[in-house]
């Protein structure tokens, strides 16, 4: 004979555990059902009755099989210095992170809780680490030989051309001046050409922390022996 | 408007059984996630949890009293019993009934009846 | 039985002070706790479920917080109408009341 399928609520064998998408609620003593993403417990299961769940209300979510009584708020809108790549559904939280020109200077679970303007490399110094999503520009001196006359995040130490006539010798921050009318480049020690970074940036002035206004839905992730689920166990 | 009230003897002998009744109006025992509680608070202590009736007939008590204790419902007359034997002194509490959430917890509650037991 | 231990017993306060009364499980209770609080001659009253939703009508000087074994009440602005015991109460397995906490005015 087959084994017969046990219906939620159901009492687990002794040691035994609760199946996928069930949990063991302590109060009955039983094997419940959990609610699907996008839903939350409603009525909490007992001897005789399941689980009952209902839709999140607007703002809200849950992106985990759970048996939370309320769903979780969805993040604020999303600060001036970031781009919302996810929006809020039933389902998932809004994700915002850092539009081009920034980098996050603070991250969440999802997304970016803090954006900051990358570094400007000044005059006489060129990018040596291009920006990143999560990390800022780092600048360097220009070696001898090479030279960066702009304030920029993405251009890097170049080197001076080479004159037949030098009219005026090049420094950290300026290209030699040539009197002759055919100039060459050479390729200084240090004229390494970096690539650029990973994402297109706009050029901007020193690090300013811009506060986001998207603090971080956290998801309280329980310890113990029967967890809501919501952020902890998924399917 | 939820209202609760909870009605039975004031004074009760040692060993006697205790009667109480909770009377509600505003919602009904037959709609799903609805519970009535009974909770106690003796002279001077805490809140105790004594017993929870859900709406589909399952029971819960506590389990130092379990062995004293019974609850009931009457869907139809909008009521809630408990019964509680082999009372004594220590038992001199104030009785409350209170309608408990589909998430459990209390939100509702009577006025209390007070009981005192003594010979 | 999970037991719930509510501290302080008692407390004196004066108006507009902040004020913190904790409960701490004896194992984890994932955030299933409702605070209550109780004025003499008068019915119990929930101020707050599930750890930190605040009922309808109560106050946005209560809040609250926590999770895993440790709960915290916390009134940002004590006012004389605040005076009463506040119970906290436990309803991840079955349901404890934690020993209560009177509250007074200086």
């Known amino acids: 004979l087959p084994a017969q399928v046990a219906f939620t609520p159901y009492a687990p064998e002794p040691g035994g555990t609760c199946r996928l998408r069930e949990y063991y609620d302590q109060t009955a003593q039983m094997c419940c059902s959990k609610c699907p993403p996008g839903q939350h417990a409603k009525v909490f299961c007992t001897k005789t009755s399941d689980t009952v769940c209902d839709s999140c209300e607007d703002s809200t979510y849950t992106q985990l099989w759970n048996w939370v009584p309320e769903c979780l708020s969805c993040g604020s809108r999303c600060s001036s210095d970031q781009v919302e790549t996810q929006a809020c559904t039933r389902e998932q939280n809004r994700i915002c992170t850092c539009r081009p020109g920034w980098y996050c200077a603070l991250s969440k679970q999802e997304g970016c809780r803090l954006c900051a303007q990358l570094r400007k490399c000044r005059p006489g110094f060129g990018v040596a680490r291009p920006g990143t999503e999560t990390s800022d520009v780092v600048c360097k001196p220009c070696a001898p030989g090479t030279f960066s006359n702009t304030t920029s995040s993405t251009d890097i130490c170049r080197p001076h051309q080479i004159c037949h006539v030098v009219a005026i010798p090049g420094n950290a921050s300026m290209d030699a001046v040539c009197t002759s009318t055919s100039p060459t480049r050479s390729m200084a020690p240090g004229a390494v050409h970096l690539p650029q970074p990973v994402s297109t940036r706009s050029q901007h002035t020193q690090p300013t922390p811009a506060p986001s206004t998207a603090p971080g839905t956290s998801f309280l992730l329980p310890v113990g022996p029967s967890p809501p689920a919501e952020g902890s166990t998924g399917d | 408007q939820v209202t609760l009230k909870e009605s039975g003897p004031t004074l009760v002998k040692p060993t006697q059984t205790l009667t109480l009744t909770c009377t509600f109006s505003?919602?009904?025992?037959?709609?799903?996630?609805?519970?009535v509680g009974w909770i106690r608070q003796p002279p001077g202590k805490a809140l105790e949890w004594l017993a929870h009736i859900w709406w589909d007939a399952d029971k819960y008590y506590n389990p130092a009293l379990k062995s004293r204790l019974t609850i009931t419902k009457d869907t139809s007359k909008n009521q809630v019993v408990l019964t509680m034997t082999n009372m004594d002194p220590v038992d001199t509490a104030t009785y409350y009934c209170?309608?408990?959430?589909?998430?459990?917890?209390?939100?509702?509650w009577g006025q209390g009846t007070t009981v005192t037991v003594s010979s | 039985d999970i037991q719930m231990t509510q501290s302080p017993s008692s407390l004196s306060a004066s108006v507009g002070d902040r004020v913190t009364i904790t409960c701490k499980a004896s194992?984890?209770?994932?955030?299933?706790i409702a605070w209550y609080q109780h004025k003499p001659g008068k019915v119990p009253k929930l101020l707050i479920h599930y750890t930190s939703t605040l009922q309808p009508g109560v106050p946005s000087r209560f809040s609250g917080s926590g999770s895993g074994s440790d709960y915290t009440l916390t009134i940002s602005s004590l006012q004389p109408e605040d005076v009463a015991t506040y119970y906290c109460?436990?309803?991840?397995?079955?349901?404890?009341f934690g020993g209560g906490t009177k509250v007074e005015i200086k």
């Open positions: 209170a309608r408990m959430t589909g998430t459990r917890y209390f939100d509702v």
């Open positions: 109460l436990q309803y991840g397995v079955l349901w404890t």
């Open positions: 194992q984890n209770i994932n955030k299933f």
């Open positions: 505003g919602f009904s025992l037959s709609t799903l996630g609805m519970g």
